[in-house]
Structures are given as C-alpha cells and as structure tokens.
C-alpha cells in the first residue's frame, strides 16, 4: 500500500480468483483514543471500533472511502483504490491501446518544434468518474524539470456503438535548448483513476523522435506564361524552430486529381517553391519534414489548381 | 530517405555537400545494423545513449547559431579555446567562433574515425562475420575531415590484446552509430547554417 496523495492510498493486488488479497491497517488521524467507529462509503454499518481498523482487501467491494467517527462527528477519511496486477502485468483497463506506432501504445506525444514543448494524448471509452494527473521529467535517475498542465477532454468521437473520449495535456521542458543533442529521454507518467481503480501509464521518448511540424503556410500558385505549369510557393510554419537555416525542413509537393485512384505526382525539394503541372480539377498539396532527422511528416497544406 | 530529392547546389561551401553525404552514410549504416542485429538491443529505446566526445569537444555549444545565444539553456558550457585555419572557412570574414566550431567538428570526426576503425578490426575477427562497418561511411568521414583541413595530432588506433567479446562489440557498435547519427545531424544543421550565412 502506498499514498497517492493526502488521504488517498493505493493497494496493489495480485489479481486472480480466490486470491488472498492484502491486509491493510487503517489509522484514524485523531488524538482521540476511545469511542472511535469505522464505516465504508455511505453505509452506516459499523465495520469495527478503535483507533485502527484491520481489513483484508481482496476485491473492489473492499475499496472505497473508510471514515472514522466519534459520537456522530467525522474524524478522518482514507480512500482506498485498487491497482490490479494480472499475471505480473499491471492492468490497463482505463485507456485504449492506440496500436500506433506499435502495440501497447496508450500515450501518444508530438512536438511542433525543438523548443521542449510537447503535447500528449490518450483515449478512453469511459465518460464519468475519471481523473488524470500527469507528471514528466527529463531522465529518471536524476530527473530534470518538465512542467505539465492539467489534462483536459480534447475530443469526443463515435466509434461504432461506443463513444470515445480523447484527453490531452501540454508539457514544457523547464530549460530546453533547441539545438541540444538529447541523451536522456523525456519520461511522461499519467495516473488514471476510474471509480476505485488506479492505473498508471508511462511513455519515454526523445523530442527529436516525436517532431511533427505544422503544415507549410501561405501556399500559393503562380501560373507560368504559355504553359500548363505553375510555380507553387509556400513558407515555413510559424511554429517551426528558428533559425530556419539551422532547423531546415524538406518538403513533399503532390499533385492529386479529384479521384483518389488517379496517379499522384510527387516532387521532393528543400526549397520553398517548386514548378509542377496543374491538371484540371486537381489540387496541390505540400507537407514538411525535418530535413536532417526523419521524424513525422506534417499534415498536408492544400490549394485547388483552378 | 529513399525518394528522389532535389538538393541545392553546395555552392561556395564545400563542406555542406560532404556533411550531407555523411548523414546519409551513417543513417544507412545504422539501418543496416538494426536489421542485421535484430536479436541484439540496437534500437533507440533499448540502448544507452553515450557520447564519446563528451567533455572532449563542444560542438553543439561552439556551433550554436547566433540567434540561440540569447537562450540561457543553450549557454551552459561555451568553449573559449582558439584553433585557426580550415579550408571550409569562407575567407577572412570567418569569425573566431566559426573557427572554433569547425575545429570541434573535426575533432568529433577524428574520434569517431578511430573508434570505428578499432571496432571494425574486432568485427573482422568475428567467426560469425555478421556485420562490418560500411567502407563508404569511413570514406565519407575521411572526405569531410580533409575538407575541414585542420592540422591536428593523429590519434593512434587503439589495439587490444585480449580476446574481443563480439556480443559487447556489436552492442557498442549500435551505441556508437546512434550517437554518431545524432552528431551528424548537428553537423549538417551547422553546415547548412554557415552556408546560408
């Protein structure tokens, strides 16, 4: 058993049918010695008397808010949560496996640049009685500071019969140098509590591996005289690290017909312009990627040919 | 990247072309190592990230773009030693910091070259003959060093008398390649920045 926060305790249980559970001793936070009784949640049934209460915690029915009273007055509370260990592996019931980029990916994180700011998000089908708290650091043995905000509900989607909820959090490394070569990964830890169930999820990454630039901005077309060709131009996104000559991007320019089946023409360039043939009803799209370290491509920025 | 790229002309700055070749070569070598050594801990998540140049060179600090010198987090350990004279330097306008930066890059390359050559000698003794260093990568390191053209003491190749532990050598190869790739990215950024300046 360990303390998650004041008056909230997590009981770790080896979770299998007929498991013996864990013996837990609760102590009433009071100078009083006599006439103390204990109850669980909203029930008025007295579970025991005395300054301490010994319970055998086996299932969720044994978890909850234990309260000690004296003469009708509440003295203190202890909330017991359960953390299930199923065959040596901590349970992951609360969050959905996003399966990207690999199985058992519960937290996904992205950064728009090298400033040390990043966003993580996760999915769940649970809509109520759910709380999250997020901590982060650079490295784990001698951790350096990363400050995270509060997790917020960022999207709701309908998937088949189920509703899916996306939560996200923004974090910022306290003293980040965009040019630094990372040798210690960022660690992100999410505590999730659903009703009386506690779970924790972690992710470990280097900022360089989670970079996904914003799409190029100011995408424009300039027709070339007496030709079907157009000059496409664009700019670096505002959110990208500067100077751009140091933090350079490479670009992919795509000409896509109205039909998805039509052949796509693609050109790769390090410049911020390209000459392409603009077909009728086609659209031109441009996306960006770090020129020197192949992390994710940005989403496409698009303009119609007409 | 396995798709055609329209690369800009290196122009007046010959080192840019060499640094791009270097990054391509080390990235290919790392990919080959990860595929060949699939049963070894060779991914970024599995290895310890060690920097053999730590406390010996200060490339990131010495080569910091002017725009980032206002960022206190980037100024932990600016070097102040002075090494002159490299053929990549674009004439007399070259600043003190630029000379320092390029000499630091040269020292990095020299250290990695020695490590890779020592390691290759060990890998050649492996009866499994599982993996060797790409000669192209070693050649590209050499070309960039020549382009930088700094005069510095030659570091003798380390020779080891004891029987090599091939498992450990292959894990060390992965660690070295990961670190060298990261340094090659920094070198490429620096050359691109200097070329634009």
């Amino acid at each position: 058993i360990w303390e998650l926060k004041k008056d909230v305790y997590v009981v770790e249980l080896d979770w299998y049918p007929d498991a013996p559970g864990e013996m837990v001793v609760l102590t009433c936070d009071t100078p009083e010695e006599d006439g103390i009784t204990w109850t669980l949640d909203q029930s008025s049934e007295v579970l025991g008397s005395g300054k301490t209460l010994t319970i055998q915690v086996k299932e969720f029915g044994d978890a909850g808010q234990y309260t000690c009273h004296k003469g009708g007055e509440v003295l203190s509370h202890s909330l017991l949560l359960l953390h299930k260990k199923e065959d040596g592996i901590w349970s992951t019931d609360i969050l959905k496996d996003q399966k990207e980029p690999k199985n058992k990916t519960f937290l996904r994180c992205e950064a728009k640049n090298y400033s040390g700011r990043f966003t993580c998000w996760w999915l769940t089908t649970i809509s109520t009685d759910l709380t999250f708290s997020v901590k982060s650091s650079r490295g784990s043995s001698d951790p350096q500071g990363v400050t995270c905000g509060a997790a917020t509900l960022s999207a709701e989607r309908v998937r088949g019969d189920n509703k899916e909820y996306e939560y996200s959090v923004e974090c910022q490394e306290d003293s980040a140098c965009p040019a630094a070569e990372e040798s210690l990964p960022i660690e992100v830890m999410v505590d999730a509590v659903h009703k009386l169930k506690y779970e924790n999820y972690t992710s470990s990454f280097f900022i360089r591996d989670i970079i996904k630039p914003d799409p190029p901005k100011n995408l424009q077309l300039k027709p070339l005289k007496n030709s079907r060709q157009v000059e496409v131009s664009w700019e670096y996104p505002d959110t990208w690290s500067t100077p751009h000559s140091y933090f350079s991007l490479t670009f992919c320019v795509q000409v896509q017909g109205k039909s998805k089946r039509e052949k796509k023409d693609r050109v790769f360039t390090d410049k911020t312009s390209a000459t392409v043939i603009c077909r009728k009803n086609a659209s031109i799209s441009v996306r960006a990627q770090d020129r020197y370290y192949s992390s994710s491509w940005s989403e496409w920025a698009s303009v119609p040919c007409s | 990247r396995n798709l055609p790229v329209a690369t800009p002309d290196p122009g007046m700055f010959p080192c840019l072309h060499h640094s791009q070749n270097l990054l391509r070569a080390v990235s290919n070598m790392l990919q080959k190592a990860r595929q060949t050594l699939e049963f070894y801990p060779c991914t970024s998540e599995e290895i310890d990230h060690e920097d053999i140049t730590k406390d010996k060179t200060s490339t990131v600090e010495a080569c910091l773009p002017l725009e980032l010198t206002k960022n206190e987090s980037c100024l932990n350990s600016r070097e102040t030693s002075f090494i002159t004279n490299g053929s990549c330097l674009a004439s007399r306008k070259t600043s003190f910091m630029m000379a320092l930066c390029l000499s630091s890059i040269y020292e990095d390359l020299k250290m990695y070259q020695v490590e890779f050559k020592t390691m290759n000698a060990k890998l050649l003794m492996d009866p499994k003959r599982q993996i060797f260093l790409d000669q192209n990568m070693l050649a590209v390191i050499d070309e960039l060093m020549q382009a930088l053209n700094f005069n510095s003491e030659t570091v003798p190749q380390k020779s080891s008398l004891e029987e090599p532990d091939f498992y450990k050598t292959k894990i060390k190869l992965c660690i070295l390649l990961h670190a060298f790739r990261i340094r090659a990215v920094t070198i490429d950024r620096v050359m691109s920045y200097l070329n634009a300046s």
């Epitope: 299998y16 040596g88 019931d93 | -």
Partner: antibody, heavy 115, light 112 residues
Framework: QVQLVQSGGGVVQPGRSLRLSCAAS????????MHWVRQAPGKGLEWVAF????????YYADSVKGRFTISRDNSKNTLYLQMKSLRAEDTAVYYC????????WGQGTMVTVSS | SYVLTQPPSVSGTPGQRVTISCSGG????????VKWYQQLPGTAPKLLIY???QRPSGVPDRFSGSKSGTSASLAITGVQAEDEADYYC????????????FGTGTKVTVLG
Amino acid sequence: QVQLVQSGGGVVQPGRSLRLSCAASGFTFSSYGMHWVRQAPGKGLEWVAFIRYDGSNKYYADSVKGRFTISRDNSKNTLYLQMKSLRAEDTAVYYCKTHGSHDNWGQGTMVTVSS
Amino acid sequence: SYVLTQPPSVSGTPGQRVTISCSGGRSNIGDNTVKWYQQLPGTAPKLLIYGNDQRPSGVPDRFSGSKSGTSASLAITGVQAEDEADYYCQSYDRGTHPALLFGTGTKVTVLG
C-alpha cells in the same frame, strides 16, 4: 472453491459451427479476464482467445481470427466460444482458463472436425 | 508458431535432478514473467511455477523455477515416478499481450 465446467464439444463436419460453454462458480466471474486454450491430439498447448473482465476487449490467435468469437455473459457467469467454418486442424481438446498469476482450468472438451 | 523453445524430451532416474530449459527472446521472456505447467495424460495442465520462481501452495518443493535474460528453466530435484508428464513453459510477448505464449513442451521420462 473456484470451478470451471465446460460443455458443448462433439463431432462436427468441416465448414460447420459449434459453440462451447464454460460455466464458472466459486468466484466473482465478472472481475476476471478469461482465456480459451486448445490442444490438438499428441500436440502442445495453443492459445486461442482472450476476453477482458467486462467483455470490452477481445483478442484472437491468427489461426482462428475471423472464424471464432469469444464472448461472456456475466449475469450467467458463463464464457463462450462460437466456432464457425471449422476445419480439420481445429480438432483438439478445448480448455477455458482464468487469467492471473494463479489460474484455474476447465476439465476440457473435445472437438472433432471430420467428414 | 511457437516462439518459446523447449527440448522435446528429458529423462532421469528416481532421485536425480532433471532440468528443462525454455528459450525465448527480449520481447517475451526478457520482458515478462514465466510460468511452468505440468500435464498428466488426459488431464488439464496444472500450475507448478508462476512469476519465474514462485511455487503455488500444494506444489512440492522439489520443483523450482528460474529465469536469466531471455531463458527460463524448471528444475526437478530428486525426480519421482509420478513426475513423468509433459511440461510447458508460458510467457507473454510485449507486442501481443494478453495472448499466451506456450513453449513447445517437454516430455519427462523417469527411468527404471
């Protein structure tokens, strides 16, 4: 006393269907994940499928994906395995089993796929 | 489809020490705990070892398990005639959990 009692096995022709049941007692069935495991005659153990305690997630071996469906009825304390498009290679003793460091197995039920 | 490799058979005379190996990889045994089962002919498997080296109550202490790196082993110290059975190791793979990964199985024969 934890008990898993299996039923539903038998002889079936290739291409036909069969449903296996596993009735649980002696524990809070709705709190635990459950597996199906099979063993072909003279062969080793092969995992078939898993279902979470609340039925929200199901996992299958590649060899049965798209043909077998694992389900549970927590109000009846029963686990099911619906097997469709049966093949000769599905012939085996099928076991249900609880998920956890200490596990409990059903007695097994024989499924024979033969024309 | 078996990722955990066991020897097909091992044998020993009563009183001898018999060991069975179970060889896997970094993503399964290297990352997860190992169980061992005993299966007597015509019966369901019975749990002998969980958590690499833990014995459930009721399992004789002549059975012991261990794990090192990407391999595990089961030792029977002072093998007895009633130990003649098939033995299976089981673990998980980090990419496919909660799918059970079983070893190929080992037939233990007690001679004499």
